[in-house]
């Protein structure tokens, strides 16, 4: 079944290469287990950046080695991507799946364009 997901159109990463935005999905109702996947679209190519499953009983938990962190509250997920470089500029799409209990719902946002500007190296001081 289809479900709406919303995310901001544009986000500027910090000088440290960190970008945060909220992914909000159509009310989860009685969804107990939700999977959130961050996808990066470059041209026609779609790659998975990170993913996490959380339950209404627990906090959102990404793998320890993940480039993402996040917190969940109701039908909103606050996602943070770390370690971004200029070449990481692109469209980041939030995909939300209501996994359990049935019925299964899936929703994808229109994407957040994240702009990453690598900091200028400091000039050598004499």
């Amino acid at each position: 079944k289809g479900m709406h997901a919303a995310q901001p159109a544009v986000v500027l990463a910090s000088s440290r290469g960190v970008a945060s935005f909220v992914c909000e999905y159509g009310s989860s109702g009685n969804a107990a287990e939700v999977r959130v996947t961050m996808l990066r679209q470059a041209g026609s190519q779609m790659t998975e950046v990170c993913a996490a499953t959380y339950t209404v009983e627990d906090e959102l938990a990404f793998l320890d080695d993940s480039t993402c962190t996040g917190t969940s509250s109701g039908n909103k997920v606050n996602l943070t991507i770390q370690g971004l470089r200029a070449m990481g500029t692109g469209l980041y799409i939030c995909k939300v799946e209501l996994m359990y209990p049935p019925p299964y719902y899936v929703g994808m946002g229109n994407g957040t364009q994240i702009y990453v500007i690598d900091p200028e190296p400091c000039p050598d001081s004499d």
Epitope: S27, S28, G29, N30, A32, E33, R35, T53, T55, V56, E57, M99, Y100, P101, P102, Y104
Partner: antibody, heavy 116, light 112 residues
Framework: EIQLVQSGGDLVKPGGSVRLSCKAS????????MNWVKQAPGKGLQWMGW????????TYADDFKGRFTFSLDNAKNTAYLQINSLRAEDTAVYFC?????????WGQGTTLTVSS | DIVMTQTPLSLSVSPGEPASISCRSS???????????LEWYQQKPGQSPKLLIY???NRFSGVPDRFSGSGSGTDFTLRISRVEADDAGVYYC?????????FGGGTKLEIK
């Protein structure tokens, strides 16, 4: 403190109707499905079905399709189980239970006795 | 419908001894997301059931580590490493993977 308090159990004659209540407190009622479980005297637990407290959509196990109705009053944080055309075999303790990915919270159970 | 078959129907164990209850499902209870929603509940006379184990092997908060769950696919086990007097009651397995969700028939644990 999360609580499910049940009421409505009674001695009812065959052919009659009854409505059992399950009042929830201590959490957001519409975030969790409410399930109903039957336990006949000296028997095991039998899953009757559940109702989505957000959409109001019920799901019934095959044995409980027809005479059984799950309903809600979200303003009162209460789930109901209505049983019509009562039979002797409906005599049981009925539990409501809140489910996420498990049942951590149960009502205390309410006893329905169907007898003439 | 998935039938959950528990064995034995009853068992009598001395305090300090281990106990094991088996639960077999009539078909795989792996849900479409890869999880197995298999739970164990304990019920004492006149009381509501209490959750012990969820998703096969996860102990619910406050449940003593004497209780453990294991298994996969269609075969599952609840183990009590050292039985105590307070463990007497009826134990039920439950599958929440495929509607209609179903309970096992129950196993009565008696303490010698």
């Amino acid at each position: 403190e999360i609580q499910l308090v049940q009421s409505g159990g009674d001695l009812v004659k065959p052919g009659g109707s009854v409505r059992l209540s399950c009042k929830a407190s201590g959490y957001t009622f519409t975030n969790y499905g409410m399930n109903w479980v039957k336990q006949a005297p000296g028997k095991g637990l039998q899953w009757m079905g559940w109702i989505n407290t957000y959409t109001g959509e019920p799901t019934y196990a095959d044995d409980f399709k027809g005479r059984f109705t799950f309903s809600l009053d979200n303003a009162k944080n209460t789930a109901y189980l209505q049983i019509n055309s009562l039979r002797a075999e409906d005599t049981a303790v009925y539990f409501c239970a809140r489910r996420s990915i498990y049942y951590p919270y149960w009502g205390q159970g309410t006893t329905l006795t169907v007898s003439s | 419908d998935i039938v959950m078959t528990q064995t034995p129907l009853s068992l009598s164990v001395s305090p300090g001894e281990p106990a094991s209850i088996s639960c077999r499902s009539s078909q795989s209870i792996v849900y479409s997301n890869g999880n197995t929603y298999l739970e164990w509940y304990q019920q004492k006379p006149g009381q509501s059931p209490k959750l012990l184990i969820y998703k096969v092997s996860n102990r619910f908060s406050g449940v003593p580590d004497r209780f453990s769950g294991s298994g996969s696919g269609t075969d599952f086990t609840l183990r009590i490493s050292r039985v105590e007097a307070d463990d007497a009651g009826v134990y039920y397995c439950f599958q929440g993977s495929h509607v209609p969700w179903t309970f096992g028939g129950g196993t009565k644990l008696e303490i010698k």
